[in-house]
């Protein structure tokens, strides 16, 4: 018995070869002996039933002269999975057709962190195995159901699933979109008084995007978090629903989601969590955003540099006179110099030598007041 594997919705070619390599009488039948089609000596294809019943069944007339009489089944259905009989030259050839299909659970657009289930639709009697390869090259193997938990952004793209049955293979391609922000987390470093821009670009594009979102903010100095802004998203248009009075945030009307804080102040330093709930999706997209604010001040004989907000313990805060070695350098959130000499002082926040934030303060000779450029 010859085995042919097919994909639902596509076409399958069931072989039937003559030993004489020339046109001959042949008939294709179902296993219950109902005729499908055949050629009875006049080179004309005769169908075994009404056109509506048999319009998916065909043969390759061009191959008949070469002694090949295939049965073509178009728009394959699961129910086509059965044994077909080719009768020619007083012999019967049995061809088993198995139709398969691989589908993704309910939706191919899934939120980051959710699970993807790939299901193999297979006919009774088959004993397939499936191996699926993710866009990042990760292989998963199993029976008729495969699950991948905790989807990541790199899982977006084309998944290739190979169904193996009796050493024969059939391949399926499924496009999966992982709905997520481009970055899970970001940090904005600003000097006190500067305008702050927060951007939340999405890692996917869809025709219509509808949902609602909110930015909760936990200021370092505050005991509890507070909702800064809530908004709606309709067909990629952003409309603000509610915004806090302090700070006075502004939000862009188009994607990517964009928020502007007029001034970076120490009382705003902290971390926020932007959540976006998409229509018809369970769960939410999240992006963490952090704001670090720097202030350099001179009070009497004390030059101080401070940072507020979520800084890593490995960050270095330094005070140095321009073009000179650092006077003070500590893994702390505040440094100071007593009786600083006159000149342009720099306050630097750095990570392994890379400057993240810089604030300059001019120290005048002792008879005058300091100037902040």
């Amino acid at each position: 018995k010859t085995l042919v594997l097919g994909k639902e919705g596509e076409s399958a070619e069931l072989p039937c070869e003559s030993s004489q390599k020339k046109i001959t009488v042949f008939t294709w039948k179902f296993s219950d002996q109902r005729k499908i089609l055949g050629q009875h000596g006049k080179g004309v294809l005769i169908r075994g039933g009404s056109p509506s019943q048999f319009d998916r069944f065909d043969s390759k007339k061009g191959a008949w002269e070469k002694g090949s009489f295939p049965l073509i089944i178009n728009k394959l259905k699961m129910e086509d999975s059965q044994t077909y009989i080719c009768e020619l030259e007083n012999r019967k050839e049995e061809v088993e057709l198995w139709v398969f299909k691989v589908t993704a659970n309910s939706d191919t657009h899934l939120l980051q962190g959710q699970s993807l289930t790939l299901t193999l639709e297979s006919p009774p009697g088959s004993s397939p195995s499936v191996q699926c390869r993710s866009p990042r090259g990760k292989n998963i193997q199993g029976g008729k159901t495969l699950s991948v938990s905790q989807l990541e952004l790199q899982d977006s793209g084309t998944w290739t699933c190979t169904v193996l049955q009796n050493q024969k293979k059939v391949e399926f391609k499924i496009d999966i979109v992982v709905l997520a922000f481009q970055k899970a987390s970001s940090i904005v470093y600003k000097k006190e008084g500067e305008q702050v821009e927060f951007s939340f670009p999405l890692a996917f594009t869809v025709e219509k995007l509808t949902g609602s979102g909110e930015l909760w903010w936990q200021a370092e100095r505050a005991s509890s978090s507070k909702s800064w802004i809530t908004f709606d998203l309709k067909n990629k248009e952003v409309s603000v629903k509610r915004v806090t009075q302090d700070p006075k945030l502004q939000m862009g009307k188009k994607l990517p989601l964009h928020l502007t804080l007029p001034q970076a102040l120490p009382q705003y330093a902290g971390s926020g969590n932007l959540t976006l709930a998409l229509e018809a999706k369970t769960g939410k997209l999240h992006q963490e955003v952090n704001l670090v604010v720097m202030r350099a001040t001179q009070l009497q004989k004390n030059l101080t540099c401070e940072v507020w907000g979520p800084t890593s313990p490995k960050l270095m805060l330094s005070l140095k006179l321009e073009n000179k070695e650092a006077k003070v350098s500590k893994r702390e959130k505040a440094v100071w110099v007593l009786n600083p000499e006159a000149g342009m002082w720099q306050c630097l926040l750095s990570d392994s030598g890379q400057v993240l934030l810089e604030s300059n303060i001019k120290v005048l000779p002792t008879w005058s007041t300091p100037v902040q450029p």
Epitope: Q82, T83, T117, P124, S127, S129, G143, K144, T145, S147
Partner: antibody
Framework: QVQLVESGGGLVKPGGSLRLSCAAS????????MNWIRQAPGKGLEWVSY????????FYTDSVKGRFTISRDNAKNSLYLQMNSLRAEDTAVYYC??????????????????WGKGTTVTVSS | EIVMTQSPAALSVSPGERATLSCRAS??????FAWYQQKPGQAPRLLIY???TRATGIPARFSGSGSGTEFTLTISSLQSEDFAVYYC?????????FGQGTKLEIK
Amino acid sequence: QVQLVESGGGLVKPGGSLRLSCAASGFTFSDYYMNWIRQAPGKGLEWVSYISSSGSTIFYTDSVKGRFTISRDNAKNSLYLQMNSLRAEDTAVYYCAREDYSNYEDYYYYYTGVWGKGTTVTVSS
Amino acid sequence: EIVMTQSPAALSVSPGERATLSCRASQSVSSKFAWYQQKPGQAPRLLIYNASTRATGIPARFSGSGSGTEFTLTISSLQSEDFAVYYCQQYNNWPYTFGQGTKLEIK
């Protein structure tokens, strides 16, 4: 533990309808293909229907085609068999059963390993 | 459809003895073949699948053999709990079909 519990059986007149349910517990129902199998009184076993884990691939034995409908609700961990135009010969104990598999290297072996206790359907005037 | 024929229809064996049950398929079913045990008022219990693989929790005294069209279930040393009806089943072609059963009785 893994359990399948059938319900919905009863006495019905010829031409009538019944809906059988099978409640699954102790496993991830949505991962498994499911089946209905029946056994007429004092007789052997007959496979009735087969449904894939997603519910989109369905097969029936010829004697019930057009009269019975198999379905599933993965959110409710339930398998159903809607039986219409019932005949006397449909009288039987109806079992729901789970298709399991084991694998050796790249080869997968499928078998019906877990069965419910059954529910009795009697079609009589 | 594939017809499964079991023999004998009934078999009387004494406890401790060996029992051999046969099943023939009307056409090849490869090794997609199973044996079930059924006791009165209970659901069938899977003993053997893939013609020769014992299901989980099935004692080693049960063994299956064969492929294609001829299959055998052997119970090496019968215990009192083994007296029941045994069914063979093919799952190579739809519809899946069962044999008519072999009743194993105490002699």
